[in-house]
């Protein structure tokens, strides 16, 4: 008799792929063109990235540091009208892209939550949740919650409103904290909360350190669903050198949980390389004309247009990983087992029942390394074969689809490998 199939877990839409943050509409679309109507025209691009949700804004009216002139129910006219928003929602739904609205109140001001009138602001948020849920949004994001007094209890209340409306609605909270204990205390009282933080932001040093951070987090959070990013809002290039971007894309897409990216992460957008641009929200480089301020700063390979035409680009890698993440059971909801592979390396297996399995090996170092995969670390249900097929490498030059002997695996500096192998009874 064939072994019984393992029962599939309940999957919410945000379990099925990546979220894509557009915190600054004008920077994303190109200055002078940033509004909701224009964003609607970019939905095909988001579809091509295979992302499942768009985290939008904040786009509400906010007079800097003025509670009275902050209206979470009103869209800032600079971004468009409620009709424009409704139209965007409908178009997004047709393309199976969910829309999450950022309601961080004082987004233009010094303290995102206004320092003195916490209860007033909390009431505004509550009213806004109910209003925008009725309008058809799929979820909410609130950032900088370390600045919100009694954050846990407010988040629990907002979660109740969101889930009370529908189990299919999501609440995301963002914090600048990288401290695991602070993160856990926020998660404790909020079962289904998706939390983005700076937890992984100092992980770029070594494979061992990254492995330790990831496994500590997963052990501490138990079987709750995680999200993976390097911060609550900023670009990957704020934290990582260019040579690690591909490695991190591979890791974020293959860890158990929801990967969360900011616009531009898919092309390696780097504010520092665009003189005069704000570090937190540089202009998106659609093509070479997107940044006219400094002639010569933008070359084709830095842009969406240029990278779309190059199968070896970061954007092409992002699209491939996003596609794999959204269709392979082992990556969608499979078990995770990290194991030793030698100094400088981080490796893990993702597997689900009798489905195809995935091995990820990441070399964070700047020297080539031989991987000594320690299969003895793995449980019997996740044993390694002698060979696995190369699905993709973050570096050019390897023959994809070819079987690699796992005992003789060698990785280039900053190389990540995604290998696949079948279930064996």
């Amino acid at each position: 008799r064939a072994p019984r199939c393992r029962e599939l877990p309940a999957q919410k839409w945000w379990h099925t792929g990546a979220l894509y943050r557009i915190g600054d509409l004008q920077a994303f679309q190109g200055h002078g063109a940033g509004n909701l109507a224009g964003l609607k025209g970019r939905l095909d691009y988001l579809s091509s990235l295979k992302v499942k949700g768009l985290v939008l804004g904040p786009i509400h009216k906010n007079q800097k540091d003025d509670v009275a002139q902050t209206d979470l129910l009103q869209i800032d006219p600079n971004f468009g009208s409620k009709e424009d928003f409704d139209s965007l929602l409908q178009s997004a739904k047709k393309k199976s892209i969910r829309v999450i609205l950022d309601l961080t109140p004082n987004y233009r001001g010094e303290n995102s939550w206004f320092s003195t009138q916490v209860d007033t602001v909390a009431t505004k948020v509550k009213d806004a949740l109910e209003f925008w849920l009725q309008a058809g949004v799929d979820g909410f994001q609130v950032r900088d919650i370390e600045n919100l007094k009694d954050a846990s209890s407010f988040l629990a209340e907002w979660q109740n409103i969101t889930k009370g409306f529908s189990e299919d609605r999501l609440l995301i909270a963002g914090t600048n904290s990288s401290d695991l204990q602070q993160i856990l205390s926020l998660l404790e009282s909020n079962k289904d909360l998706l939390l983005t933080s700076s937890y992984l932001s100092d992980s770029g040093s070594t494979g061992e350190h990254t492995k330790s951070l990831v496994t500590q987090y997963l052990n501490a959070t138990g079987n709750r669903w995680c999200s993976w990013s390097l911060s609550q809002a900023r670009l990957l290039t704020s934290f990582l050198p260019a040579q690690l971007l591909r490695l991190y894309q591979l890791m974020l897409f293959t860890l158990p949980g929801t990967p969360v990216f900011s616009y531009g992460d898919e092309i390696g957008l780097d504010a520092a390389a665009l003189p005069g641009q704000p570090m937190e929200a540089p202009v998106m480089l659609w093509d070479e004309s997107s940044f006219p301020d400094i002639p010569g700063a933008v070359s084709a390979n830095m842009t969406v247009k240029g990278q779309s035409e190059d199968p070896g680009s970061l954007l092409s890698l992002f699209r491939r990983l996003s596609d794999q993440r959204s269709k392979e059971r082992s990556l969608l909801h499979g078990d995770f087992h990290a194991f030793s592979a030698g100094p400088g390396l981080f490796s893990y297996i993702r597997h689900w029942d009798q489905n195809e399995r995935f091995l990820v090996v990441l070399n964070f170092g700047d020297v080539g390394l031989s991987a000594g995969l320690q299969a003895s670390d793995l449980p019997a249900s996740a044993s390694l074969p002698a060979k696995a097929d190369l699905l993709l490498s973050t570096q050019p030059g390897r023959e994809e689809g070819s079987p690699l002997e796992l005992e003789r695996l060698k990785l280039e500096p900053h190389e990540g490998l995604l290998l696949r192998f079948p279930y064996a009874a």
Epitope: H31, A272, G276, M302
Partner: antibody, heavy 118, light 113 residues
Framework: EVKLVESGGGLVQPGGSLRLSCVTS????????MTWVRQPPGKALEWLGF??????????EYSASVKGRFTISRDNSQSILYLQMNTLRTDDSATYYC?????????WGQGTLVTVSA | DIVMSQSPSSLAVSVGENVTLTCKSS????????????LAWYQQKSGQSPKLLIY???TRESGVPDRFTGSGSGTDFTLTISSVKAEDLAVYYC?????????FGGGTKLEIK
């Protein structure tokens, strides 16, 4: 011809305030970033910050040494750039230059001298 | 923050000589995306405002004599003045513009013997 002319410098006591102006002509003011740089007597140049152009929302960027004390603003109708300096300290004494563009500064004013002294 | 260091702090040369000024940054100014170095050179004559000479580490600003040449990549940069003229007497500053703040070096004072 591009022209930048600073004014408003002078002697001020520690803790005091001063507002410098930079009157511009010869280019479409709203199209350009405008930068402030200072130079203490006999010392090196120090980048203070800039204000972005219309296309970039006239937002500002500051160096850590002046953030919170100095404010860069602009009057686009008159093509004038301002530097409001508060809580001045003796080490703010310098010649203050305005310049056009954010990074590679091809056009500079002649500078205005600010002396902070009791 | 990236620190910009210039050496020597001053040097004296005779008219007609070649001179090399050095600028070092504490981190690379080379961006892999466009293979450009985010470094500029300025000349400041006594009692005058600075003047842009070079940007992208090696591109001469229009109107700058071709005896001024910028070179280098990553963290090490040089400004070479070939066949120095008396009018080149000035302080020369490098400036980085990759990431804020857009720091200047301490300057090199060029004196004529």
């Amino acid at each position: 011809e591009v022209k930048l002319v600073e004014s408003g410098g002078g002697l001020v006591q520690p803790g005091g305030s001063l507002r410098l102006s930079c009157v511009t002509s010869g280019f479409t003011f709203t199209d350009y970033y405008m930068t402030w740089v200072r130079q203490p007597p006999g010392k090196a140049l120090e980048w203070l910050g800039f204000i972005r152009n219309k296309a970039n929302g006239y937002t500002t960027e500051y160096s850590a040494s002046v953030k919170g004390r100095f404010t860069i603003s602009r009057d686009n109708s008159q093509s004038i750039l301002y530097l409001q300096m508060n809580t001045l300290r003796t080490d703010d004494s310098a010649t203050y230059y305005c310049a056009r563009d954010p990074a590679t500064l091809a056009y500079w004013g002649q500078g205005t001298l600010v002396t902070v002294s009791a | 923050d990236i620190v910009m260091s210039q050496s020597p702090s001053s040097l004296a040369v005779s008219v007609g000589e070649n001179v090399t000024l050095t600028c070092k940054s504490s981190q690379s100014l080379l961006y892999s995306g466009n293979q450009k170095n985010y470094l500029a050179w300025y000349q400041q004559k006594s009692g005058q405002s600075p003047k842009l000479l070079i940007y992208w580490a090696s591109t001469r600003e229009s109107g700058v004599p071709d005896r001024f040449t910028g070179s280098g990549s990553g963290t090490d940069f040089t400004l070479t003045i070939s066949s120095v003229k008396a009018e080149d007497l000035a302080v020369y500053y490098c400036q980085k513009y990759y990431g804020y703040p857009y720091t200047f070096g301490g300057g090199t004072k060029l004196e004529i013997k």
